[in-house]
């Protein structure tokens, strides 16, 4: 059987087994034929007439081979005493099995008194004369455990006490737990313990490309079965479990930490160039921030903010903008403002002085608006608003920015206060307003800011007009919009008017004129 190592198997011996018998006229070495008329060797005894039989049949010396406990599998036939006339009282239907340990072969010098009895063995099925037809003999198989053993070898002996008996085969074996891999730990084969209840602890070795999660151990039972697995190994980073082994992650897959999990496909915008990848490298122009986990997609810096508008009020300017159209795959966008003063021309600019004040701050702005104060009067300024995310500082490319140029003055136009709707269509709205009460100079243009209601922070649009009326096109039907208007002079932009809400017309239903 599996997990069994034979020390002796007489069924593989051709001819006499060469065992010792004592006394004479006890056990006989006899060649028989089996059910298929193949020759088989047996030892037989049938001294059923005389009482007090004591016939011994002893095996040759069997080396122990490191086994602490062995098993004897005896195949035998035993004749029913009732089938033999006139022997009741002297005929027996059992025999005894004994063993003797020794460190060397003792030859013929063993004595009955040295042997230890293992058990008395009876047949599960004895047979009568009526059962003898065409060699249909009732074969009995009995297994007995012997142990604990400590010497280099041993003998087994059969003691006949008056039975009609044939020993057809003897197999002596020990059990071992076979080498196996369990929980990614390799356990080498282990010989079972010395008694029927003992468990032998065996420590496992993690298979290639795996590491201990908890010390892997199993226990080898007396029956040659592995029991109670404790602890385990897990595949290392870059490897996944497949059929009791750890296999490298394939190209395009990765595993970042040791564990039970399988290799995962590389996140978006990344790749693995070699097997057994622990992380996936970002594609060209894509990056992973220091705190991004390996499972995160690679991202890139954002594009420039859009719709940057300025509102000059004397020596202050309010800047407003919309988020970039491409956030680079990230949500951690902030804004930086760069202020440049251009005394002579826009091509010759310098950094603004330290006296310039930015509200709330100049860098890491979370909101898309900024007040810049303490500017010089009647001075040209260029403001750059750059969008920044968690990987902007990893890119060697210059940052994208929106630019607006302004000239400070002492007074910008006042607020446009009267604004009304002239007409509203499905996709356009016409507006009409009055010039500010204090233009403070020649009004160069008007700027209309509009956006879907409640969506100003997401996106807004602007439109320029040189008169006090304008039609805004490209709107969505049936949608409520917010409109604001402001004036611009050479001194800068005034404040936006109060918001005015207008709803575009709903689309007309189409009527089916077919009958």
């Amino acid at each position: 059987g599996r997990g069994e190592v034979n020390l002796l198997d007489t069924s593989t011996i051709h001819g006499d087994w060469g065992w010792l018998t004592y006394p004479a006229h006890g056990w006989d070495s006899i060649n028989e034929v089996d059910e298929s008329f193949r020759p088989i060797h047996t030892y037989q005894v049938c001294n059923v007439m005389s009482p007090n039989q004591n016939n011994w049949l002893r095996t040759n010396w069997v080396p122990r081979d490191g086994a602490r406990r062995v098993y004897a599998e005896i195949k035998f036939t035993l004749r029913d005493c009732n089938s033999i006339p006139g022997v009741l009282g002297t005929c027996k239907e059992t025999f005894n099995l004994h063993y003797l340990e020794s460190d060397r072969d003792l030859g013929a010098s063993t004595q009955e008194s040295q042997f230890l009895k293992i058990d008395t063995i009876a047949a599960d099925e004895s047979f009568t004369g009526a059962d003898l037809g065409v060699r249909r003999l009732k074969l009995n198989t009995e297994v007995r455990g012997v142990g604990p053993l400590s010497k280099r070898g041993f003998y087994l002996a059969f003691q006949d006490i008056g039975a009609c008996l044939a020993i057809l085969s003897l197999r002596i074996y020990y059990k071992k737990c076979p080498a196996m891999v369990r929980n990614l730990a390799a356990f080498s084969e282990a010989v079972t313990g010395a008694d029927s209840s003992s468990l032998v602890e065996v420590r496992g070795q993690c298979v290639r490309h795996s590491e201990e999660r908890d010390t892997p151990k199993m226990y080898c039972s007396a029956e040659g079965e592995w029991l109670v697995p404790i602890g385990k190994c897990v595949c290392s980073a870059g490897y996944e479990e497949r059929r009791d082994a750890c296999m490298a992650c394939e190209l395009g897959f990765y595993k970042s930490a040791p564990g039970d999990q399988l290799c995962a496909r590389c996140p978006p915008h990344s790749h693995s160039a070699t097997p057994a990848a622990q992380t996936c490298r970002c594609d060209l122009s894509y990056y992973r921030a220091a705190l991004d986990p390996p499972s995160a997609a690679c991202t890139r810096p954002p594009s420039a903010p859009v719709n940057l508008i300025s509102s000059v009020n004397g020596t202050s300017v309010t800047l407003e903008w919309a988020p970039p159209l491409d956030p680079g795959g990230r949500s951690d966008i902030t804004y930086n403002a760069v202020c440049r003063r251009c005394p002579w021309a826009l091509s010759h600019c310098e950094a603004c002085g330290s006296g310039t004040r930015f509200v709330p701050q100049q860098t890491s702005l979370a909101q898309a608006s900024l007040l810049v104060a303490n500017l010089l009067a009647h001075m040209n300024y260029s403001f750059w608003i750059e969008a920044v995310n968690g990987v902007s500082n990893l890119s060697p490319e210059p940052r994208s920015a929106a630019v607006v140029n302004i000239t400070t003055n002492q007074a910008a136009p006042s607020q446009v206060v009267v604004i009304r709707q002239e007409r509203a269509g499905q996709t356009s709205v016409s507006l009409l307003w009055q010039e500010p009460e204090q233009p403070n100079g020649i009004i160069l243009e008007y700027e209309i800011k509009y956006y879907e209601k409640d969506k100003e922070m997401q996106s807004y649009s602007t439109l320029k007009a040189v008169t006090t009326r304008a039609t805004v096109s490209g709107l969505k039907p049936g949608t409520r919009y917010v409109f604001q208007v402001r004036a611009r002079t050479s001194a800068g932009c005034g404040r936006f008017s109060q918001a005015m809400e207008v709803e575009t017309g709903k689309p007309r239903p189409r009527y089916d004129t077919r009958t």
């Epitope: 007439m49 036939t77 002297t90 009526a130 003898l132 065409v134 003999l137």
Partner: antibody, heavy 121, light 106 residues
Framework: QVQLLQSGAEVKKPGASVKVPCKAS????????MSWVRQAPGQGLEWMGW????????TYAQGFTGRFVFSLDTSVSTAYLQISSLKAEDTAVYYC??????????????WGQGTLVTVSS | EIVLTQSPATLSVSPGERATLSCRAS??????LAWYQQKPGQAPRLLIY???TWATGIPDRFSASGSGTDFTLTISRVEPEDFAVYYC????????FGQGTKVEIK
């Protein structure tokens, strides 16, 4: 060497008795039963019965009760067949044969050379 | 009592030929059957017991089979020393012999 030794030929008158000995050697006499077989001149074999050499208990075949007696002297490993009131039809060779019981079956495995008993007036 | 009938009464064969002897019981004897060989002036000799098991020292040209009521003794290639009378014998509670088959030279 296992053997059974019988006495020489006997000539007896009708009505007389004869005691045929069978001496065993080469094995433990009490470990095997002893059987007796008759063979009339030119005829086949007839089983007369057997005796348990350990208990001395005899078993007789049909037609061999009454005048035929099996006995033992274990001290000299000898079995005996005694026939009384001899008749002419008792003229035959009488064989003793050792009975062998085995796991696989029984048989008479060792035979004496036979004793010819002639009954003639 | 169980009656054993052997056939044929006489079997004539040449040396080297196959000889087949039959023994039929009046009722089942299972495998409790033995075969004996007797040569003129000699005691019988046990050939087979248990219907098919060779006795000690019997050559393997002798083989036997059967169970219940029909039994066969076969001599695969008859040798000169095999010419003799062959008896079957059953051993139940009471033992009986067949009347014998004489194997003679053809």
């Amino acid at each position: 060497q296992v053997q059974l030794l019988q006495s020489g030929a006997e000539v007896k008158k009708p009505g007389a008795s004869v005691k045929v000995p069978c001496k065993a050697s080469g094995y433990t006499f009490t470990s095997r039963a002893m059987s007796w077989v008759r063979q009339a001149p030119g005829q086949g074999l007839e089983w007369m019965g057997w005796i348990n050499t350990n208990t001395g208990n005899p078993t007789y075949a049909q037609g061999f009760t009454g005048r035929f007696v099996f006995s033992l002297d274990t001290s000299v490993s000898t079995a005996y067949l005694q026939i009384s009131s001899l008749k002419a039809e008792d003229t035959a060779v009488y064989y003793c044969a050792r009975v062998r019981f085995t796991v696989y079956g029984d048989g008479m495995d060792v035979w004496g050379q036979g004793t010819l008993v002639t009954v003639s007036s | 009592e169980i009656v054993l009938t052997q056939s044929p009464a006489t079997l004539s064969v040449s040396p080297g030929e196959r000889a087949t002897l039959s023994c039929r019981a009046s009722q089942s004897v299972s495998s409790n059957l033995a075969w004996y060989q007797q040569k003129p002036g000699q005691a019988p000799r046990l050939l087979i017991y248990g219907a098919s098991t060779w006795a000690t020292g019997i050559p393997d040209r002798f083989s036997a089979s059967g169970s219940g009521t029909d039994f066969t003794l076969t001599i695969s290639r008859v040798e000169p020393e095999d010419f003799a009378v062959y008896y079957c014998q059953q051993y139940g509670p009471s033992w009986t012999f067949g009347q014998g088959t004489k194997v003679e030279i053809k």
